[in-house]
């Protein structure tokens, strides 16, 4: 029995946040070969879908407004009881998000963290937001929930991640909410990627001609490894996006990504990263540092890759 | 700074129409929802709901189902409350306020409804 | 509805004496309250919020206590342009609802 002797167990997929219009099926677990079960509301706003009905297996909620945010239960079908019906479930919070602007979502130190550090998620507002939430894509599990704090016309709240696992690697956004309607949240904040370092072997960074260019020349980096990756990373030195490429089968049996970096103009430092498909956001450890130098030009920085790069979709499958 | 900018008052006789705006500045008019709030002659303070800026949802309280409407226009930054069907008893001072712990006021809109 | 309970209704007090007005929540609002001061032909002025939060500008005579239905707002000194209607209002549940004020007078 899932949810004890006499209590089924009521969960919510996808997940229990729900944007607005969305769907989400609710499904009552009780005892097998009892599936009928009623669904309740705890609370006085009216979702007049459930008076007096029973459901089958599970049920579909949507498009759902902002008074289908709240706490249900359900009770599951029990013929030869004295009232019909099982003891009330568990508790199942569902909240529906776009009902105010949304709030931004920061990582300190960085979005890439080695395996077993901490992270600190900040959700902060100018909407006076009362609670923050933290939740992560794919996860069916109530989003952690933190007091905003308000200084100097923000609202804000730390989330503290970690040590960090595989597990806890993932695309991550957060909402706000005001007091007097808790589980109407708000716009989701932009995603923010964490990913975790540290978990494979490093693979090896090279530059062709070499890593003192003249400027102007065309230069291209070469991130390679024996380990299969699927996937390279290239990140720069004080700059918060990365490029990717699908990794090369090489004849020499190394898997190997060429980044054309164009022609040189200024320096950097950079560094590569392998990961697997399965696991978009766990990569190796970091390849060893390599300095670029372009000589004939100041060592400033360096221009943005002409290709968009964007702050998310790192733990998107690259297709 | 944070202002709130409401109409001036009216006087109108019972079963007619009132429309009260209230301009806001300073701010980003979508991150507060708007509050409206009624004070009688003599009587304390009421809530009548409020409007949600971003979403454009109204809540009203019990007592302002039906008659009181809460709209928005939101390029002006503005929101408004109408009373349809005007009695005696709507005569009051009314306020809008922002944000969820009323943050800001304004001044008031006096509304006499007699004949 | 929840009922704010606010007392006294009205009182007098002298310049420089410490005031303190109560409000009582009919169920557990969390620290979810405001108060207000209102005088004639004014706007009406926000002095607290989350219970004890002094909102920026207001003189730090005026703090705010309290957690779940016991809630106070004190005036340490008064002075003359403290007189005036206060109210409490709770915004922990729609509807809000409002205290029935209290009328401070000058002796």
């Known amino acids: 029995l899932m949810g004890g002797q006499d209590k089924p167990f009521l969960s919510a997929r996808p997940s229990t946040v729900v944007p607005r219009g969305g769907h989400v099926a609710l499904q009552c677990h009780y005892r097998r070969g009892f599936n009928n079960f009623m669904l309740y509301k705890e609370d006085r706003s009216h979702v007049p879908i459930f008076h007096g009905r029973i459901f089958q297996e599970s049920f579909i909620m949507g498009p759902v407004t902002p008074a289908h945010a709240g706490t249900y239960r359900c009770r599951g079908s029990r013929p030869h009881s004295l009232t019909g019906w099982s003891a009330p479930s568990n508790p199942l919070v569902i909240m529906v998000t776009g009902n105010h602007r949304k709030p931004s979502l920061l990582a300190h130190p960085g979005p890439l963290v080695k395996s077993g550090e901490r992270v600190i998620l900040q959700c902060w507002s100018d909407v006076m937001f009362e609670h923050f939430f933290l939740h992560r894509e794919g996860i069916s599990e109530d989003p952690s929930r933190l007091v905003g704090q308000i200084h100097d016309g923000v609202s804000k709240a730390n989330f503290s991640i970690g040590p960090l696992m595989p597990v806890l690697a993932g695309t991550y956004r957060c909402y706000g909410s005001v007091p007097h309607s808790p589980y109407q949240l708000s716009a989701p904040s932009d995603p923010l990627d964490i990913v975790i370092t540290g978990l494979y072997e490093k693979p090896s960074l090279s530059a062709q001609p070499g890593p003192t260019v003249q400027a102007g020349e065309n230069v291209t980096l070469s991130c390679s490894s024996w380990s299969s990756y699927d996937i390279y990373h290239l990140s720069r030195e004080g700059e918060a996006h990365e490029r990717r490429l699908r990794a090369v089968p090489k004849v020499n049996r190394t898997f190997q990504a060429d980044f054309p970096l164009g022609p040189a103009t200024h320096g950097g430092t950079y560094r590569c990263f392998g990961s697997f498909r399965a696991l978009p956001c766990v990569w190796s450890n970091s390849s060893d540092p390599l300095l670029v130098s372009v000589t004939g030009n100041p060592s400033s920085s360096w221009p943005s890759p002409t290709e968009p790069s964007s702050k998310s979709g790192i733990c998107r499958h690259l297709h | 700074q944070i202002q709130l900018v409401q109409s001036g008052p009216e006087l109108k006789n019972p079963g007619e129409t009132v429309k009260i705006s209230c301009k806001a500045s300073?701010?980003?008019?979508?991150?507060?929802?708007m509050n409206w709030v009624k004070q009688a002659p003599g009587k304390g303070l009421k809530w009548m709901g409020w409007?949600?800026?971003?979403?454009?949802?109204?809540t009203y309280a019990d007592d302002f189902k039906g008659r009181f409407a809460f709209s928005l226009e939101t390029s002006a930054s503005t929101a408004y409350l109408q009373i349809n069907n005007l009695k005696n008893e709507d005569t009051a001072t009314y306020f809008c306020a922002h944000g969820p712990w009323l943050a800001y006021w304004g001044q008031g809109t006096l509304v006499t409804v007699s004949t | 509805d929840i009922k704010m309970t606010q007392s006294p209704s009205s009182m007098y007090a002298s310049l420089g004496e410490r005031v303190t007005i109560t409000c009582k929540a009919s169920q557990d609002i969390n620290s979810y309250l405001s108060w207000f001061q209102l005088k004639p032909g004014k706007s009406p002025k926000t002095l607290i919020y989350?219970?004890?939060r002094l909102v920026d500008g207001v003189p730090s005579r005026f703090s705010g206590s309290g957690s779940g239905q016991d809630f106070s707002l004190t005036i340490s000194s008064l002075e003359c342009e403290d007189m005036g209607i206060y109210y409490c209002?709770?915004?922990?549940?729609?509807?809000?609802?409002f205290g029935g004020g209290t009328t401070l007078e000058i002796k």
């Open positions: 209002l709770q915004y922990d549940e729609l509807p809000y609802t």
């Open positions: 409007i949600n800026t971003y979403t454009g949802e109204p």
């Open positions: 989350r219970a004890n």
């Open positions: 300073g701010y980003i008019f979508t991150n507060y929802g």
